[in-house]
Structures are given as structure tokens and as C-alpha cells.
């Protein structure tokens, strides 16, 4: 139960992170006009990974897209497939775990496959928090050098445009959404990687046993049932587990083939 | 068409208020900024403030701020300014402008303006 | 604030003839989000308001004549009346509407020779 859970939970934790880095991505406020010196102004600009904004105190707003791709700087790129790379790992991952939930049953797919299913997506929703959380601080980090950068009057725009001496940029929305967003993807792929340890059916070992039957000894070898010595019910045989917390049932239960959810 | 209507002129003692009226007309009120210029005899032009009909919002110049106080009337679509400690320095033609969409912050519709006269 | 310098103060032409008048701006008026210049021309003829003639340093408001031309970028803007005609004797202010306040220049008066 713990596991269907953990796992269920770590799903739809990383499903919402994944949601926000897309989101992050699509956003045009990565980069917001400082406005610590006039906190109203009349013309305010924005930025994001692919385009940027203007708005004016009318309420009009402008977006032109970078159309050129060789003149953006190497570190705008580098974010954009962090972002890109990040949305289809999580995308995959999403996939994935989709049909390794405990609670959704396909075929006759063994807790082993799922487990590893669980765990490969687990993998991919760690990679993706990474790939975001590393795109946003690549970019913040782009940003406070600027930032610092346009004091000393040395101006470069997001898409190779000559700055004004009063347009500085600071953190926008998108930075934070990023953050929390692959802090969530990551979060869901703990869960789902914690999950998948308690999926994976453990080897059933059993203590060695002697049995001193009136005429010969037999000794009961690891494996379950498996162990036949050809004799009529063994009333005394007992399975003793060196781990495991599951059932019987649970052990036994396998999805026969019209068993479809 | 689009029009703003101001009283022709107002005569004030020095040390009174006033409140000058803008009612718009010709188009959706709320939808646009309404700015306000102070102009004095033979003189230059002079931004005092701006106002957002929709939600009340106004931004002033500081030199006005503690002369002019701006507010709206949504169901008469009209703009009002209110100028208090009346002096003759604010003897002036007064006029609300639209800020026009789209046209960076330049305003496309201007009233014929209100002249305040300061006199005892 | 932005302080805006017209010149000149005043300008004396005939019928017909080409005129240019200067503003500078303290400040640059050009943005960098979409790099447009954020400066207006306006037109006010004795008795009347301000008319807009030019806003985002080049571009006419619906209109107006195409004799009227708008240029620079930056902090130095002209405006050019390529042949003056009578109904264009008035004071020619520019204003920034980049940053607040607003501010207007001290404008050129346009009279007949």
C-alpha cells in the first residue's frame, strides 16, 4: 500500500513539475526590467528564452521573437536545451511511469518489469529536475553578470541587441517557476526510484531445513513450492522468509490474460 | 467620434480648489489612460499625471503630486482633477489627453482645455 | 527627469520652403526591447489643443500630411516639413514618452516670413 503510494505520489509530483518546466519554457518573463530606481514606468520590458516583450503604460504590449539563431549568445542556447531536454526526458519518464503504476494493470506484466519501469522513469524525472534547475541558474547566473555588466555601461540584450544605459534586467516569474518546477521533477523521481525498491519482487530465500522423515532425510531447497520430494502433503513444511513483507496472496497473485484494466 | 468635453474656464481665489472636469465620449472609457497637461500662458507644455479609468490607478509627475488629485467616474465616463492651495502660478489652460494604444505613450485625442484663472 | 531641448526657439520661412527643426533629449529615448524610439511630435496652433503629429520618432498619426517628417534615434530627433504651407504656421513641441514624468520641450514657433 505504502508503495502504490510513494508511487503514485511521486508520479503526480513530477507530472506538476513537468507541467511548470514547460510553462517555464513558454514563458516571456525570465528577465524583467529592473525597477528598483522607478517602480512605474512607462515603457516596461520583459524577456524570455524566445522572445522578447515591451510593454507600454497604454497596456499595448509587443513581442518580437529572436528570429536569428546564430546571433543569440551560446548561453541562451545552452538553456534552451537544458529546458528542451528536461521537457522530453520528463515527457518520456511521464510515459513511462504511466504504465508502471502499481495501480494500472496491463497483460500479464510481472511486479519485476514494472519495477524497473519505475525506476528507469524515477531515473528520467531526476535528469529532467537537473536538466531545468541547471537551465534556470545558467540563465540567472547570465543575468546577474549583466546585471552588474549595464552598471559598468557595458550592454548586450538577450538577442544581441545594444541596451539602453536605463534598461537593467533582473530575475522574472519564469526563474522561479523553473526552479520550483525541476525541484518537483526531482522530487517525484526520488519517490519513484524509493518506489521501485519496495516493487521489486526480492529472491524468496528460505532457511535450510532438515526434515527427518521415518526412512530418508530430505532437505527443502530455496524456491517456494518448487521443491517437490514426490511425497503426499507435507503438513509440517514451512516456508520461513529471510525478507519480504508481502503475502501470500500477493506472491501468488498474477494477472491472468483477460485480466485487463 | 472620439471627443472630450472641458468646461471653457474657471475663475478661483487664491488658496481655494478646484475641480476640473473631463467627460469622455466616442469610445469604451476604461480602455484608455487619461492624462493631464498643464500649459501657462505663452508657455511650454507640462505633464502633471495620469490616470486608469478602469481600476482608479494614477501616477503623477512629483511636481504635482501634492497640487493634483485625479479620479474617475466610470458611469459618466468622465475624468476629474482636482488642484488645491490655488496660487497664480497655477493660472493655466489645463487639458486631458487619451494615451492612444499603441502609440508608445503619445496622446492621440487632446480636450479643447480648461483656463483656471488664480485671481482675488 | 528627462529634459528635452528644442531648437530652434523660432523660425521664420516662406511659403514652399523646406524646414527642419531639432530635440534633444537628456536621456536616450530609444528602447531596447524592441528598439523603438519613444519620442512624439505635436502640433498646436494659437486658441488650440496639442495635435499628435508624429509618435515613435518616424511614424505619422492617421492623417497627417506626408510633408511632415519624423527621424532620429537615441537623443537627436528632427522633424522636417518639406514644403511649408500656411496652415503649418504653429509651435512644434516634442515630447519623451519613454520614461516618467513626461516631459515636453520648450518647442519651435513656426512663423511666415
Known amino acids: 500500500m505504502a508503495v502504490t503510494a510513494c508511487q503514485g505520489l511521486g508520479f503526480v509530483v513530477s507530472l506538476i513539475g513537468i507541467a511548470g518546466i514547460i510553462a517555464a519554457t513558454c514563458m516571456d518573463q525570465w528577465s524583467t526590467q529592473d525597477l528598483y530606481n522607478n517602480p512605474v514606468t512607462a515603457v516596461f520590458n520583459y524577456q524570455g528564452l524566445w522572445r522578447s516583450c515591451v510593454r507600454e503604460s497604454s497596456g499595448f504590449t509587443e513581442c518580437r521573437g529572436y528570429f536569428t539563431l546564430l546571433g543569440l549568445p551560446a548561453m541562451l542556447q545552452a538553456v534552451r536545451a537544458l529546458m528542451i531536454v528536461g521537457i522530453v526526458l520528463g515527457a518520456i519518464g511521464l510515459l513511462v511511469s504511466i504504465f508502471a503504476l502499481k495501480c494500472i494493470r496491463i497483460g500479464s506484466m510481472e511486479d519485476s518489469a514494472k519495477a524497473n519501469m519505475t525506476l528507469t522513469s524515477g531515473i528520467m524525472f531526476i535528469v529532467s529536475g537537473l536538466c531545468a534547475i541547471a537551465g534556470v541558474s545558467v540563465f540567472a547566473n547570465m543575468l546577474v553578470t549583466n546585471f552588474w555588466m549595464s552598471t559598468a555601461n557595458m550592454y548586450t540584450g538577450m538577442g544581441g541587441m545594444v541596451q539602453t544605459v536605463q534598461t537593467r534586467y533582473t530575475f522574472g516569474a519564469a526563474l522561479f517557476v523553473g526552479w520550483v518546477a525541476g525541484g518537483l521533477t526531482l522530487i517525484g523521481g526520488v519517490m519513484m526510484c524509493i518506489a521501485c525498491r519496495g516493487l521489486a519482487p526480492e529472491e524468496t530465500n528460505y532457511k535450510a531445513v532438515s526434515y527427518h522423515a521415518s526412512g530418508h532425510s530430505v532437505a527443502y531447497k530455496p524456491g517456494g513450492f518448487k521443491a517437490s520430494t514426490g511425497f503426499g502433503s507435507n503438513t509440517k513444511n514451512k516456508k520461513i522468509y529471510d525478507g519480504g513483507a508481502r503475502t501470500e496472496d500477493e506472491v501468488q497473485s498474477y494477472p491472468s490474460k483477460h485480466d485487463y484494466v | 467620434q472620439v471627443q472630450l468635453q472641458q468646461p471653457g474656464a474657471e475663475l478661483v481665489k487664491p488658496g481655494a480648489s478646484v475641480k476640473l472636469s473631463c467627460k469622455a465620449s466616442g469610445y469604451t472609457f476604461t480602455r484608455y489612460l487619461m492624462h493631464w497637461v498643464k500649459q501657462r500662458p505663452g508657455q511650454g507644455l507640462e505633464w502633471i499625471g495620469e490616470?486608469?479609468?478602469?481600476?482608479?490607478?494614477?501616477n503623477y509627475n512629483e511636481k504635482f503630486k501634492s497640487k493634483a488629485a485625479l479620479t474617475v467616474d466610470k458611469s459618466s465616463s468622465t475624468a476629474y482633477m482636482q488642484l488645491s492651495s490655488l496660487t497664480s502660478e497655477d493660472s493655466a489652460v489645463y487639458y486631458c489627453a487619451r494615451l492612444a494604444y499603441g502609440y508608445g505613450n503619445a496622446v492621440d485625442y487632446w480636450g479643447q482645455g480648461t483656463s483656471v484663472t488664480v485671481s482675488s | 527627469d528627462i529634459v528635452m531641448t528644442q531648437s530652434p526657439s523660432s523660425l521664420s520661412v516662406s511659403a514652399g520652403e523646406k524646414v527642419t527643426m531639432s530635440c534633444k533629449s537628456s536621456q536616450s529615448l530609444l528602447n531596447s526591447g524592441n528598439q523603438k524610439n519613444y519620442l512624439a511630435w505635436y502640433q498646436q496652433k494659437p486658441g488650440q489643443p496639442p495635435k499628435l503629429l508624429i509618435y515613435g520618432a518616424s511614424t505619422r498619426e492617421s492623417g497627417v500630411p506626408d510633408r511632415f517628417t519624423g527621424s532620429g534615434s537615441g537623443t537627436d530627433f528632427t522633424l522636417t516639413i518639406s514644403s511649408v504651407q500656411a496652415e503649418d504656421l504653429a509651435v512644434y513641441y516634442c515630447?519623451?514618452?519613454?520614461?516618467?514624468?513626461?516631459?515636453f520641450g520648450a518647442g519651435t514657433k513656426l512663423e511666415l516670413k
Open positions: 490616470i486608469n479609468p478602469s481600476n482608479g490607478r494614477t
Open positions: 515630447q519623451n514618452d519613454h520614461s516618467y514624468p513626461l516631459t
